[in-house]
Interface confidence: low
């Protein structure tokens, strides 16, 4: 399933360099192992951002179809309960780009532990 | 087990073009960057460029843009360097490697030698 | 584009001795993202540490890695006759993913 998430993230990626989203997203960019979990729900819950800035048809159909199966994915984490992880608010804001990157590196570190 | 393997070594004349490739296995080729490094006779290590074979984004160190493309055939599992048009200071022994934990190269291939004299 | 700098150029130890090698950037490495390769004649690079001082996949525990923002160390605690190479430092977030001129570590 994180395999499709990187396929989805990178899907994103192309179809937003045609447009202009001057928006900036809450990113952790340097995800501890502890904390991986609650990253990456915020990188799911800006995500939508993307999503609703873009109005964009197959951009939401990508959006909806990565969160699907990275909740999917992250329920085989169980419940895993982190704790003295930064609240997404608490995160830099970066532009759509160093986002999706930070995002991607993420996911490989989801890959790398499964 | 993942494995980097690339083609073997060339000799070539200055002008000649060149692709050399690194067939990877063992794990999924569209999930992970595939860089490429230079070792010149007796230096250190240069790091040329990367790219991501899930959609072929492509950086390049900018020494090396412009100087060499960098591709890869999702098809077959293979990245590739090339060259347009050789110089004898392309001489060299050339790596392939993953981009593993945050893009360090985690697993190298065991190195492609180019000679490039007339 | 991040420049390393490695100290010293080379290293004359003996085996059992514990050496340090030093890697310095031109500006912070974000997220500490350092990784040491060592390499012997006529083979490949490998992956010892990155982040850092995170231990790569199958290294000994005699090789451990330190630092952040500009300053970065390599510390191998008892030399084996086998550790005896170059070592080269790369900052692994951005691109390009530049690396350090390298340092020998050569028997006494």
């Known amino acids: 399933n994180w395999v499709n998430v990187i396929s989805d993230l990178k899907k994103i990626e192309d179809l937003i360099q045609s447009m202009h989203i001057d928006a900036t997203l809450y990113t952790e960019s340097d995800v501890h192992p502890s904390c991986k979990v609650t990253a990456m729900k915020c990188f799911l819950l800006e995500l939508q951002v993307i999503s609703l800035e873009s109005g964009d048809a197959s951009i939401h159909d990508t959006v909806e179809n990565l969160i699907i199966l990275a909740n999917n994915s992250l329920s085989s984490n169980g419940n895993v309960t982190e704790s003295g992880c930064k609240e997404c608010e608490e995160l830099e804001e970066k532009n759509i780009k160093e986002f999706l990157q930070s995002f991607v590196h993420i996911v490989q570190m989801f890959i790398n532990t499964s | 087990e993942v494995q980097l393997v690339q083609s073997g070594a060339e000799v070539k004349k200055p002008g000649e073009s060149l692709k050399i490739s690194c067939k990877v296995s063992?794990?999924?080729?569209?999930?992970?960057?595939i860089g490429w490094v230079r070792q010149m006779p007796g230096k250190g290590l240069e790091y040329m460029g990367i790219?991501?074979?899930?959609?072929?984004?492509?950086r390049y160190s900018p020494s090396f843009q412009g100087q060499v493309t960098i591709s890869a055939d999702k098809s077959i599992s293979t990245a590739y360097l090339q060259w347009s048009s050789l110089k004898a200071s392309d001489t060299a022994m050339y790596y392939c490697?993953?981009?593993?934990?945050?893009?360090?190269?985690?697993?190298w291939g065991q190195g492609t030698l180019v000679t490039v004299s007339s | 584009e991040i420049v390393l700098t490695q100290s010293p150029g080379t290293l004359s130890l003996s085996p059992g001795e514990r050496a340090t090698l030093s890697c310095r950037a031109s500006?912070?490495?974000?997220?500490?993202?350092l990784a040491w390769y060592q390499q012997k004649p006529g083979q490949a690079p490998r992956l010892l540490i990155y982040?850092?001082?995170k231990l790569a996949s199958g290294i000994p525990d005699r090789f451990s890695g330190s630092g952040s923002g500009t300053d970065f160390t390599l510390t191998i605690s008892r030399l084996e006759p086998e550790d005896f190479a170059v070592y080269y430092c790369?900052?692994?977030?951005?691109?390009?993913?530049?690396f350090g001129q390298g340092t020998k570590v050569e028997i006494k």
């Open positions: 490697a993953r981009g593993g934990h945050w893009n360090a190269f985690d697993i």
């Open positions: 063992g794990y999924f080729f569209t999930t992970y960057w």
């Open positions: 790219i991501y074979p899930g959609d072929s984004d492509t």
């Open positions: 500006q912070s490495v974000i997220g500490s993202y």
């Open positions: 982040s850092a001082s």
């Open positions: 790369q900052q692994h977030y951005s691109t390009p993913g530049t």
